[in-house]
């Protein structure tokens, strides 16, 4: 065919446009071409010819007369995507062809399943709440909005913001609680997430907090604690950061904590803890239980020899802890614990309130008053101190047989033995857990020999029982544990003395050092039961006013007692042990004095020592005749220098056959000593006495001399 003049090649006059269309929806890709003769139109997708109804009448794609490609419904699966791609239309006639611009057909998609469904959220009112949502996969990428209780949320409210799938409520209120749904939307449609519940709880708050309280012992007390919150908070109490001990406390329906009868042990910080799912609040208050002062140990009258040391116990309790002080009746001078000791004072009060007087003088005799004072009241107790001659110096009581540990049954009878001896004869009393016993309990009696009997035993009778043998010369105690159980024996096994080993012989001193004494003894007399071991007891007036156990489980009959004080007089006793118990004590050893502390290390400045000794001024008091053959010498020192080891008391006869005989010496080897007793003097004789300080071989200035005449007979009272 010949080219006609009016013919012209195809030209695309309407190009197809990019399109996004939902799966299953119809769509059209437009294409219009001009040319003569009229061009034929074909479509290509991704370079491959597109089949239309012209090829297969069943095809879902139709080629329209205009040249446009019409899709009856877009076909698009999870994997097969036959309609998606890049399309061009091609217009052809015999003069040539024209190709349109590319047009992409994308299938809009909105899956059903949310990538992230919002989850239930629980917040406390006032806190921010965040609900998170990731919409289903989709094309175009879905946007989201939120519904609360099926109503769309207006995010114009300043507390609410929606950013990147997150719904944020900055300051939640109770009214924000409800069911929230995230809606994902694009051109395909909308998808609702699973609903999520926002629960707005309220943290616990106190309507009424407990307040600090101060009560007297045995009074009732209540701590109130009123709370609110949602959910209703649980309320519990703690004491001093620990759970409340059982049995002493009532907690009422309104969470008030009540103590019917307060005790000092109830004192502390009580904390009310209110807790719910969203918070925990604590409020605390202190309870102070005032207890008036009471005596735990009262001072007792004591008879003490001159030169010895006495201790008056005065132990008190109360809340607050009582302030204890002492005074001698008739004196304005008050003595307090922890008070720096005055240079010449022989009195001191221990932190627990015990009054100690050293180097007893006749002038110390009298009544001593212990007073205990608190804001809850005051108490006082008097004790008499009698001062006797040195010769009446006696050891404290000896407990021959003390109580034994035992386990007894409920409703059984306990017999706790305590047999004591001494001069003067001691009085026996009992303590349970350190407190006077038996009090008013009719089940308990102290029998004639001192044995404590407790009938109809109860579990509460379990405890440590102490027998105390007391006399003017001191006190001795012996403790045993009574354990009352459902399955124990019904009555104490009363050991016969024949079950026990015999007492050992009097201990002999075989060696003495400054800190130790070596003793030897013989076992009990033949015919008595053998000992499996021994215990050694010691007494020293300057250490305490009671016998002390200084060695246990001694397997031999020769033993060195260590840890003793230098230059101190001790008495010793030995007891034998077998499985049934302890023997009576051996006779007392002779008094033994430990050696004095050796002089300080060499390297002392001799000139300094001599200078200081030369400055010491010793003032000798008038000597006191104690008996026809004993005289007490006392002195004072103006200043106590660093270098003094002791004082040399020098005395000689100035009448009678040996007048102006040579000086005899008695060394007071303790630098703090201010008295000495001269013994074995002659009756009715005048003696000259003077005192000289010394340090090693260096000697200070003698005091002025004093004279004294011993009597022919014992001085009258």
């Amino acid at each position: 065919s010949r080219l006609r003049q009016e013919d012209f090649p195809p030209r695309i006059v309407e190009h197809p446009s990019d399109v996004i269309v939902s799966k299953g929806e119809p769509t059209t890709l437009n294409c219009k071409a001009e040319g003569r003769p009229t061009p034929t139109i074909e479509w290509y997708k991704d370079g491959e010819r597109v089949e239309t109804d012209k090829d297969d009448p069943r095809s879902h794609r139709m080629l329209l007369p205009s040249g446009s490609l019409f899709f009856l419904r877009i076909v698009h699966g999870r994997r097969s995507k036959p309609d998606e791609g890049s399309y061009v239309c091609v217009a052809r006639n015999y003069l040539g062809e024209a190709v349109s611009r590319n047009a992409s057909l994308e299938v809009a998609l909105l899956r059903d399943d949310f990538r992230q469904n919002p989850t239930d959220v629980v917040v406390a009112a006032g806190e921010p709440a965040i609900l998170e949502c990731q919409p289903p996969r989709g094309h175009p990428e879905p946007t989201i909005y939120w519904k609360k209780d099926k109503v769309r949320i207006d995010d114009k409210e300043e507390r609410i913001s929606i950013r990147g799938g997150k719904l944020m409520i900055s300051n939640t209120r109770k009214s924000d609680a409800g069911m929230y749904t995230c809606v994902g939307t694009n051109m395909v449609g909308e998808r609702d997430s699973d609903p999520a519940e926002l629960t707005v709880f309220e943290r616990p708050t106190f309507l009424r907090r407990p307040i600090n309280q101060v009560v007297l012992e045995e009074e009732a007390v209540e701590f109130r604690c009123q709370v609110q919150g949602d959910p209703q908070p649980t309320v519990r109490w703690k004491k001093d950061d620990a759970d409340l001990p059982r049995g002493r406390y009532d907690i009422k329906d309104d969470y008030t904590l009540r103590i019917k009868k307060t005790m000092s042990t109830d004192e502390g910080t009580y904390m009310c803890i209110a807790e719910n799912r969203v918070g925990k609040m604590e409020a605390s208050a202190t309870l102070t239980v005032r207890a008036p002062p009471q005596f735990v140990v009262r001072p007792r009258d004591q008879i003490v020899a001159q030169g010895r040391t006495v201790t008056f116990p005065c132990e008190t309790k109360g809340n607050p802890q009582p302030a204890v002080f002492w005074q001698k009746e008739g004196s304005q001078n008050l003595l307090f614990p922890n008070q720096p000791q005055q240079p010449n004072s022989r009195c001191s009060v221990s932190p627990t309130g015990d009054l100690t007087i050293t180097n007893i003088q006749r002038s110390d005799a009298g009544y001593y008053i212990c007073q205990a004072l608190t804001v809850a009241g005051s108490i006082l107790a008097k004790a008499q101190l009698e001062v006797t001659d040195v010769l009446t110096d006696r050891p404290p009581p000896i407990i021959l047989q003390g109580p034994a540990n035992q386990t007894l049954a409920v409703d059984g009878t306990a017999l706790l033995k305590c047999k004591a001896t001494g001069d003067p004869l001691p009085v026996i009393s009992w303590l349970k857990e350190g407190f006077t016993f038996p009090g008013r309990d009719p089940r308990a009696t102290i029998q004639e020999q001192g044995t404590l009997q407790i009938k109809n035993l109860r579990i509460s009778d379990t405890g440590t029982y102490t027998c105390v043998a007391t006399s003017s010369s001191g006190e001795t105690s012996w403790s045993a544990v009574l354990d009352v159980t459902e399955s124990g024996a019904t009555i104490s096994k009363n050991y016969d003395l024949s079950d026990l080993p015999g007492p050992p012989s009097k201990p002999q001193v075989t060696d003495v050092t400054k800190n130790s004494v070596t003793l030897s003894w013989q076992p009990g007399t033949p015919g008595t039961l053998p000992a499996s071991a021994y215990i050694i007891e010691a007494f020293s007036q300057s250490v305490s006013n009671s016998w002390q156990t200084v060695a246990n489980h001694v397997k031999t009959t020769l033993y060195t007692v260590r840890g003793l004080r230098p230059n101190t007089i001790y008495l010793f006793m030995v007891r034998a042990i077998n499985p049934q118990g302890l023997s009576d004590p051996s006779p007392m050893s002779d008094p033994v004095r430990t050696q004095d502390i050796s002089p300080p290390a060499q390297g002392v400045d001799h000139r300094q020592v001599q200078k200081e000794l030369g400055d010491v001024l010793v003032r000798l008091h008038n000597p006191v005749v104690l008996t026809p053959t004993t005289v007490q010498v006392t002195w004072t020192v103006d200043r106590q220098p660093q270098f003094i080891q002791g004082y040399r008391v020098m005395y000689r006869q100035t009448s009678g056959l040996q007048a102006t005989s040579s000086w005899q010496n008695l060394d007071a080897k303790v630098p703090t000593e201010r008295s000495a007793v001269l013994v074995n003097l002659k009756k009715g004789v005048t003696y000259e006495i003077k005192v000289r300080p010394y340090f090693n071989e260096f000697q200070g200035m003698d005091s002025e001399s004093k004279t004294v005449r011993t009597t022919e007979e014992a001085p009258s009272a």
Epitope: D46, V50, G77, R78
Partner: antibody, heavy 118, light 105 residues
Framework: EVQLVQSGAEVKKPGASVKVSCKAS????????MHWVRQAPGQGLEWMGW????????EFPQKFQGRVTMTRDTSISTAYMELSRLRSDDTAVYYC???????????WGQGTMVTVSS | DIVMTQSPSSLSASVGDRVTITCRAS??????LNWYQQKPGKAPKLLIY???SLQSGVPSRFSGSGSGTDFTLTISSLQPEDFATYYC???????FGGGTKVEIK
Amino acid sequence: EVQLVQSGAEVKKPGASVKVSCKASGYTFTGYYMHWVRQAPGQGLEWMGWINPKNGDTEFPQKFQGRVTMTRDTSISTAYMELSRLRSDDTAVYYCARESGDDAFDIWGQGTMVTVSS
Amino acid sequence: DIVMTQSPSSLSASVGDRVTITCRASQSISSYLNWYQQKPGKAPKLLIYAASSLQSGVPSRFSGSGSGTDFTLTISSLQPEDFATYYCQQSVGLFFGGGTKVEIK
């Protein structure tokens, strides 16, 4: 007309390999995923995997990994399935099936009987 | 893998009966479930796609329902040509159920 035509029956010895072909016509071959399904005598249908003819991507269930190979030749609109190391329990009818845009197998081949016997 | 459990494995029915076959997925598959019919010596034929959509050319007596994990194929009035084996298939992982054979009573 849209159709899938498979190659003829095969008899193989254990340990050998078999390659079955599936020729598509009446539609754009690259627009639809091709799947292979087999059915042992008297048994149910067992899916063996797919190939995307557009790019040659494949996916197989764990059971067939390492033993099955799926390929295609777009120039002749044909898909192939090769099963190696044959065992007697591989005796089955092997079908190719087109996955429609509705995620279902709308067009199936007539099936190829593969017998594995020594 | 998502496991498809079909029940019953076989049933006997008469022409005109209403027949129900169930298919359960071991986990949710939304609506991605298809039903096929297979007659002896023939390739399977698609009946229902996307749980409830009827494939073009399939008689309306066939219907599908369900979503998530539980699905049903119902034949409202069984016809002689309906005696066959029916398979469900999940189109997420593409595995088939074990099949249900519908036989003449």
